[in-house]
Amino acid sequence: APRGTQAEESPFVGNPGNITGARGLTGTLRCQLQVQGEPPEVHWLRDGQILELADSTQTQVPLGEDEQDDWIVVSQLRITSLQLSDTGQYQCLVFLGHQTFVSQPGYVGLEGLPYFLEEPEDRTVAANTPFNLSCQAQGPPEPVDLLWLQDAVPLATAPGHGPQRSLHVPGLNKTSSFSCEAHNAKGVTTSRTATITVLPQQPRNLHLVSRQPTELEVAWTPGLSGIYPLTHCTLQAVLSDDGMGIQAGEPDPPEEPLTSQASVPPHQLRLGSLHPHTPYHIRVACTSSQGPSSWTHWLPVETPEGVPLGPPENISATRNGSQAFVHWQEPRAPLQGTLLGYRLAYQGQDTPEVLMDIGLRQEVTLELQGDGSVSNLTVCVAAYTAAGDGPWSLPVPLEAWRPGQAQPVHQLVKEPSTPAFSWP
């Protein structure tokens, strides 16, 4: 019978040893067995479980000429970069005939300088604003005690005496560095150094100071900026189209904003070149040498209406007996608001000017009472919004109607607000 088939007689002549070291270590475990006949495949166990994907090698050396003679089998298991999950009890296992043989165990342990699971990260904070930093380290060996340092100065008298995993900082007024030392029986590991950049606080109380149709004057209260003076503030304005959907806290506008920079102080800015009678959203951020604050929430504002910037266009005025027909087109120039209607001024030579409110119509027929012999009659038209009248057109002379000249269908002006007029 092949050697090693008796339960009491193990084929193993060399058992795995022990490895203890730091994370990342590359190590090798070996076992050796002597068997008669066909050499078996050597399997490796960790804590009793077969390692299916073990990085293991196997060498077989015959001790005689015949295949049925004894063989020496050496198996090696590689641990390429030791991690906590690699630690445990290791054994070799072989199946010989109907029996299973397991080597004596070897042990793999992890012991070294502390290993950081979490380190403080770079971040920006507003001046005088509380924040937390995190640091976490483990052994083995345990315990691992932490010591926080601010600008290379320890924040406690000894490791383990101050804050541990989380450091609460009530606020900073200057950019500072933080690191964390992890101490265990093997020594000290120092974390990365995190730079905490102190930015200005978000400005407050953004509000309108004054409004004009194409101009808004706004002001705000600056936030604290630590030891770093504010260099400038930046104001953004964006059209509040109905479909745009700027929310109070939305970080970025959906379209390119109008951006203006303000030297500070004063914390005030006149925003020009705006559209009249238009809703905008505005926000402000202030900058120091360390960087910009966060933006304020979007503030909805609106430019007021203005008067139309030009007169109505293409005015024509014709007279046929006791009737006069006047028509015109909407001004080409910006209305600067909602058009409410037109005013018409009618004047003859040596007669007072008469004003009429035509409403939104763009034509009117005047019933001229009397003999209609008033000479040099002229008509002027102006558009108006809630803000007032726009400029009057140049006087247009009332021409006699010639047969064949087109005359649109029209209504006589009979309404109480626009009665027929006569000149003495």
Partner: antibody, heavy 125, light 107 residues
Framework: EVQLVESGGGLVQPGGSLRLSCAAS????????IHWVRQAPGKGLEWVGW????????YYADSVKGRFTISADTSKNTAYLQMNSLRAEDTAVYYC??????????????????WGQGTLVHHHH | DIQMTQSPSSLSASVGDRVTITCRAS??????VAWYQQKPGKAPKLLIY???FLYSGVPSRFSGSGSGTDFTLTISSLQPEDFATYYC?????????FGQGTKVEIK
């Protein structure tokens, strides 16, 4: 007698490919890890990678990862280094070496006890 | 990766001299250090493994010592065939890394 013999080196264009062979005799390739190490002209030694020929597992230096592939054919007792996307800085003598494994039940680290004679890989200028 | 810094980068010595080459690791590598000898146009040869163990067939005038971060290769009495370049190598972590080499020349 343990011996390693490399072959396959030569002149190559930048971006080109080459396959080096490492024929082993006097020992079984499946019993140890085989390493590839290179040496640029007039420079020191740089590890390229290793293979476990028994399992086919390979491990690479960052400088060659994704471009070089190490393989082995245990029936031919030969290891291979397939080099693709070659660069000027890959110009070197390439050695294969056997890992020494004579340290009892466990060891930390490793050494390379048998080396091939080396094969030169160089670029057109 | 762990850096291995060898010193000196070269030295001149006479036959019979005691020669010491040092190697410093950038972090603790326990005793996972090997030393190799390389002659021009030839492959490296293993001299010392595991910091202090003499490899089979290597003359006993070669010895190694050290652990942690500082390692030494000593040639107790330099012989004509010892003029070569010597490299240290750590294998505590993967990738293994080599020192830049120390060239031992005839004075």
């Amino acid at each position: 007698e343990v011996q390693l013999v490399e072959s396959g080196g030569g002149l190559v264009q930048p971006g080109g490919s080459l396959r080096l062979s490492c024929a082993a005799s006097g020992f079984s390739l499946s019993g140890s890890w085989i390493h590839w190490v290179r040496q640029a002209p007039g420079k020191g030694l740089e590890w390229v990678g290793w293979i476990n020929p028994y399992r086919g597992y390979a491990y690479y230096a960052d400088s060659v990862k994704g471009r070089f592939t190490i393989s082995a054919d245990t029936s031919k007792n030969t290891a291979y280094l397939q080099m693709n996307s070659l660069r000027a800085e890959d110009t070197a003598v390439y050695y294969c070496a056997r890992e020494y494994s004579g340290w009892g039940g466990s060891s930390v680290g490793y050494a390379m006890d048998y080396w091939g004679q080396g094969t030169l890989v160089h670029h057109h200028h | 990766d762990i850096q291995m810094t060898q010193s000196p980068s070269s030295l001149s010595a006479s036959v019979g001299d005691r020669v010491t080459i040092t190697c410093r690791a950038s972090q603790d590598v326990s005793t996972a250090v090997a030393w190799y000898q390389q002659k021009p146009g030839k492959a490296p040869k293993l001299l010392i493994y595991s910091a202090s163990f003499l490899y089979s067939g290597v003359p006993s005038r070669f010895s190694g010592s050290g652990s942690g971060t500082d390692f030494t290769l000593t040639i107790s009495s330099l012989q004509p065939e010892d003029f070569a370049t010597y490299y240290c190598q750590q294998s505590y972590t993967t990738p293994p890394t080599f020192g830049q080499g120390t060239k031992v020349e005839i004075k």
